[in-house]
Interface confidence: low
C-alpha cells in the first residue's frame, strides 16, 4: 500500500513528475491566446475601446530591477516582421474616404544612418522637409535604391520605379536606416549611407559606403505619402511645406514596427488640425487591425498604446489653400507582458514580474495538491506567454502529511462532490513528542456504502476511533490521538455522491491541551501553548451567536490534559 501522494515534493527531480507542465505554443494570429486590449494614459477619457492604464502591468519598466527582466538586445538580431499595410479596413470613425491602401511611390528616398537617437538631421531651408528622428532598420515592405559613387538623385523618375515589395525580411546586415517614401513631396535628407545594398530586376547589386548631402525632389503627382519606422523610438511629424496640386489634399501614412514582444506607445506632443482633417491610429500585427484612436481623442498629452508590435497612423488633410494642420507625436516601444496568471482556487500565486523572464510561483492550501507546473516563466514572443498552463489545486485522494502541525484534509472534489469508486488513505504524523487533535468541519456522505474511518495509529489495521457506519452523530469535540498518528480512510462505492469531508487537524505537545477551534468566531487564551491551567474565552463574529459548549473552557488533568468543556459553536443569528 503506497501512502505517498502523487505530487512533486522537494527533493524530487523537477521537470519529471510534474503533470500538465508541457510547453504551450505561442499564440498565433489565427488563434489568439486572449482578446487583445490596449491602454491609454492621461488625460483620462472615457474612450471607445480604451482601457485605463494597468499600473502593475505597464509601469513595471519604471521599477528598480526591471531592466534585468528585459530580453537581451531587444531590438536585435531578428528584423521586425514584414509589413503588410494593404488593405487595412475598419479605421475608427472613418468617413467615406478610402481606407488604407498600399502606397505605390514613384521613387524612394536614399536610406540614411542617423548619428544618434536624438534626431541628427537639420532641416534644409531650400527644400520641404520631413523630420525623422528615429534610428530605424529598413522595413521589408519597401525596396530601397542606393546611389552609386558620384551619382546624383534625379528629379524625374528613373526608368525602373521602386514599388512596395513583400519579399521577406530586410537586409539586417546593415545598420538601421530610415526609409522615406514620398509622392507629391520634396524631402531633404542629410546623413550617412552605410553599406546599403539594393537589387534590381537584372539581379545587379550596388553597394556603397559614402557620405552625402542630397536633396531629392520627386514627381508632383497626386497620391499618398508614406513613411516606415522600425526603431525602438522616434518622432512622427506632420509633413510641412508639401506642395500639392491645388485640388488634392494629403493622404499620408506612418507605419511603425518594433521588435516582437514589444508594443507601440504613441504620445501626442502637439496637435493642431483644421476642421475636416483626420488622424487615425491602428494597431497592426494581430489577426485584424485594431482601431486605437482618431483625431477626436488625440489631445495633447494623450498616450495611445498598441498591444501589438506594429501600428499605423494615417493623416488626411485638406487641399490648399486651407493647408494642412500640424501634429508632433513621439512613439516608443514598450515591453509587453504576460497576462496575470489565474490564482488557483484553494491556492496562491506569487509573481516576480509579468514581463518576459518573470516568473509565477504557485502554492496550494493545506489539503490540496498542485496539479501542473509549480513555476511558470513568461516567455518573449509577439504576445508574451507563460511557458506552461496555469496549474490547479486539487484535493488529493490520500497522502502522507508528516510534521502535521495545523491544517486540513479534504476529500477529492471538495467542496463539490467526490467521485465514485474512490479509496483514499491519509496518514497524519505529528512532530516528535506531540499528539493530534482532529476536528470535523464537515462530513457529508451518500447514504449507501460510502464510508469514513479514522484510526488511532499509522496503518489500516489500527483501531478505529470513528467509523461513519457505526456513529450517527459527529463528535463535536473532535478526536484525540493517543500517539502521533491518525490514519484516515475514505471509500466510496459506484453510486451516489456527496460533498465528502473536511477535517481540521492540529498537533499539541504532551502535557498540553490541543489548540481550540471555533468556526465564525475567535478566542483568547491565557497562554499560547495551552498547558494545564490555561483558560480560553470564545466569542463569535458579528451576526453569529454562541451555542452549545461553554464560553470559557479550561485545560485540566495533568495526567491526561483535556478541556473541561466542549468548544462552543457559532451559529448565524
Amino acid at each position: 500500500l503506497s501512502l505517498e501522494a502523487p505530487t512533486v515534493g522537494k527533493g524530487q527531480a523537477p521537470g519529471i513528475e510534474e503533470t500538465d507542465g508541457e510547453l504551450t505554443a505561442a499564440p498565433t494570429p489565427e488563434q489568439p491566446e486572449r482578446g487583445v486590449h490596449f491602454v491609454t494614459t492621461a488625460p483620462t477619457l472615457k474612450l471607445l475601446n480604451h482601457h485605463p492604464l494597468l499600473e502593475e502591468f505597464l509601469q513595471e519598466g519604471l521599477e528598480k530591477g526591471d531592466e534585468e527582466l528585459r530580453p537581451a538586445l531587444p531590438f536585435q538580431p531578428d528584423p521586425p516582421a514584414p509589413f503588410t499595410p494593404s488593405p487595412l479596413p475598419r479605421l475608427a470613425n472613418q468617413d467615406s474616404r478610402p481606407v488604407f491602401t498600399s502606397p505605390t511611390p514613384a521613387m524612394a528616398a536614399v536610406p540614411t544612418q542617423p548619428q544618434s537617437k536624438e534626431g541628427p538631421w537639420s532641416p534644409e531651408s531650400e527644400s520641404p522637409m520631413l523630420r525623422i528622428t528615429a534610428p530605424l532598420p529598413p522595413g521589408p515592405s519597401m525596396a530601397v535604391p542606393t546611389l552609386g559613387p558620384g551619382e546624383i538623385a534625379s528629379t524625374t523618375p528613373p526608368s525602373r520605379a521602386w514599388t512596395p515589395t513583400q519579399e521577406g525580411p530586410g537586409d539586417m546586415g546593415r545598420p538601421w536606416v530610415a526609409e522615406v517614401v514620398s509622392q507629391g513631396a520634396g524631402i531633404g535628407i542629410q546623413g550617412t549611407i552605410t553599406s546599403s545594398t539594393a537589387s534590381g530586376d537584372d539581379e545587379e547589386t550596388t553597394t556603397t559606403t559614402t557620405i552625402i548631402t542630397t536633396t531629392i525632389t520627386t514627381v508632383q503627382t497626386p497620391g499618398p505619402c508614406s513613411w516606415n519606422f522600425s526603431g525602438p523610438e522616434g518622432s512622427l511629424d506632420s509633413p510641412t511645406d508639401l506642395s500639392s496640386p491645388t485640388d488634392v489634399g494629403l493622404d499620408c501614412f506612418f507605419y511603425i514596427s518594433v521588435y516582437p514582444g514589444y508594443g507601440v506607445e504613441i504620445k501626442v506632443q502637439n496637435i493642431s488640425l483644421r476642421e475636416g482633417e483626420t488622424v487615425t491610429v491602428e494597431g497592426l500585427g494581430g489577426p485584424d487591425p485594431l482601431p486605437l484612436a482618431n483625431q477626436s481623442f488625440l489631445l495633447r498629452g494623450q498616450v495611445i498604446r498598441s498591444p501589438t508590435h506594429q501600428a499605423a497612423l494615417r493623416f488626411q488633410s485638406l487641399p490648399p489653400p486651407a493647408g494642412p494642420g500640424t501634429f508632433h507625436f513621439h512613439y516608443q516601444a514598450y515591453l509587453l507582458s504576460c497576462h496575470f496568471p489565474r490564482r488557483p482556487a484553494y491556492g496562491d500565486v506569487t509573481v516576480t514580474s509579468l514581463h518576459p523572464g518573470g516568473s509565477a510561483r504557485f502554492h496550494c492550501a493545506t489539503g490540496y495538491q498542485l496539479k501542473g507546473a509549480r513555476h511558470l516563466t513568461c516567455l518573449n514572443a509577439t504576445q508574451p506567454f507563460w511557458d506552461s498552463k496555469e496549474p490547479v489545486c486539487i484535493a488529493a485522494c490520500g497522502g502522507v502529511i508528516r510534521n502535521a502541525t495545523t491544517g486540513r484534509i479534504v476529500s477529492p472534489g471538495f467542496p463539490g462532490n467526490y467521485s465514485n469508486n474512490l479509496t483514499c488513505h491519509w496518514l497524519l504524523e505529528a512532530p516528535e513528542g506531540q499528539r493530534l487533535h482532529l476536528h470535523f468541519e464537515k462530513v457529508s456522505l451518500a447514504e449507501d456504502d460510502d464510508r469514513l474511518i479514522i484510526r488511532n495509529g499509522d496503518n489500516v489495521e489500527a483501531p478505529p476511533v470513528y467509523d461513519s457506519y457505526e456513529v450517527e452523530y459527529l463528535p463535536i469535540e473532535g478526536l484525540l490521538s493517543s500517539g502521533k498518528h491518525f490514519f484516515v480512510e475514505l471509500s466510496t462505492d459506484s453510486s451516489g455522491a456527496a460533498a465528502g469531508m473536511a477535517l481540521r487537524y492540529e498537533a499539541f505537545q504532551q502535557g498540553h491541551c490541543y489548540e481550540p477551534f471555533v468556526k465564525y468566531g475567535n478566542f483568547s487564551s491565557s497562554t499560547p501553548t495551552y498547558p494545564v491551567g490555561t483558560t480560553v474565552e470564545f466569542s463569535c463574529d458579528p451576526g453569529y451567536t454562541l451555542e452549545q459548549g461553554s464560553i470559557i473552557i479550561e485545560c485540566v488533568d495533568p495526567h491526561d490534559p483535556q478541556w473541561n468543556e466542549t468548544e462552543p459553536a457559532c451559529r448565524a443569528v
Epitope: A13, P14, G21, E68, T350, G357, R361, H375, D387
Partner: antibody
Amino acid sequence: QVQLQQPGSVLVRPGDSVKLSCKASGYTFTSYWMHWVKQSPGQGLEWIGEIHPHSGSTNYNEKFKGKATLTVDTSSSTAYVDLSSLTSEDSAVYYCVGGHYDYWGQGTTLTVSS
Amino acid sequence: ENVLTQSPAIMSASPGEKVTMTCSASSSVNYMYWYQQKSSTSPKLWIYDTSKLTSGVPGRFSGSGSGNSYSLTISNMEAEDVATYYCFQGSGYPLTFGSGTKLEIK
C-alpha cells in the same frame, strides 16, 4: 537523480577573468531558473543572480552587476558565471543552484592570488 | 533589498532540548526557505514554503511564520543537527539570505 557538477577549485591572478561552469543533469534544464550564490570564507551566502535557460533572461543582484555575467549552453545543459577584474575580494566558493532553489552544486573554490 | 536578520547568531543546545531560531525580514515575504549547511559541504534545502520539510528531513524539524517573522524549530535536539541554518527569501529581487544561525551542541 539531479546532479549539478562544478569544478572543485580554480586559481587565478588578480585582474584576470574566469568562467566557472555548472553542468546539470537529472532534470529539465530549460524549465527552471539557474541561480549562482557566493560564499566568502567564513561568511554567509550572497545571491549573485539567476538565468532562465529557456529564454536567456537574467536577473542580477545590483552588487554583482559588472562583476558577474551569467550565460547558459542549453545543448550541453551547462550554466556559466563569468567573473571579471578579479581581486582577492572575489576569492570565495561559488555555487550553482538549480530547480526551485532545491539543488546545489558542490561549489567551486575560486582563489585569486598572485 | 529585503534584509533577513537571523537570531541568535550562535546558539548551543543539549540533546533532547527544544531549539528555536528566528528570521526577521525588513519587508514582508510570502514564503520562507531554510537551508542547513554543515562544514565544508553545500547548503541543503531543509524547509520550503515556510513549513514544508524537504524529503528526508527528520520530523523533529518544523517551520512557521508569516509576513516579516519566521522561525525554525527543532523539537528535540540531536547531535546530527549541529550545522549553520540560513533563511532565504525568493519573493522579491534581489533574492536574499539571512546571515545564518550556527547551532552547536552542549
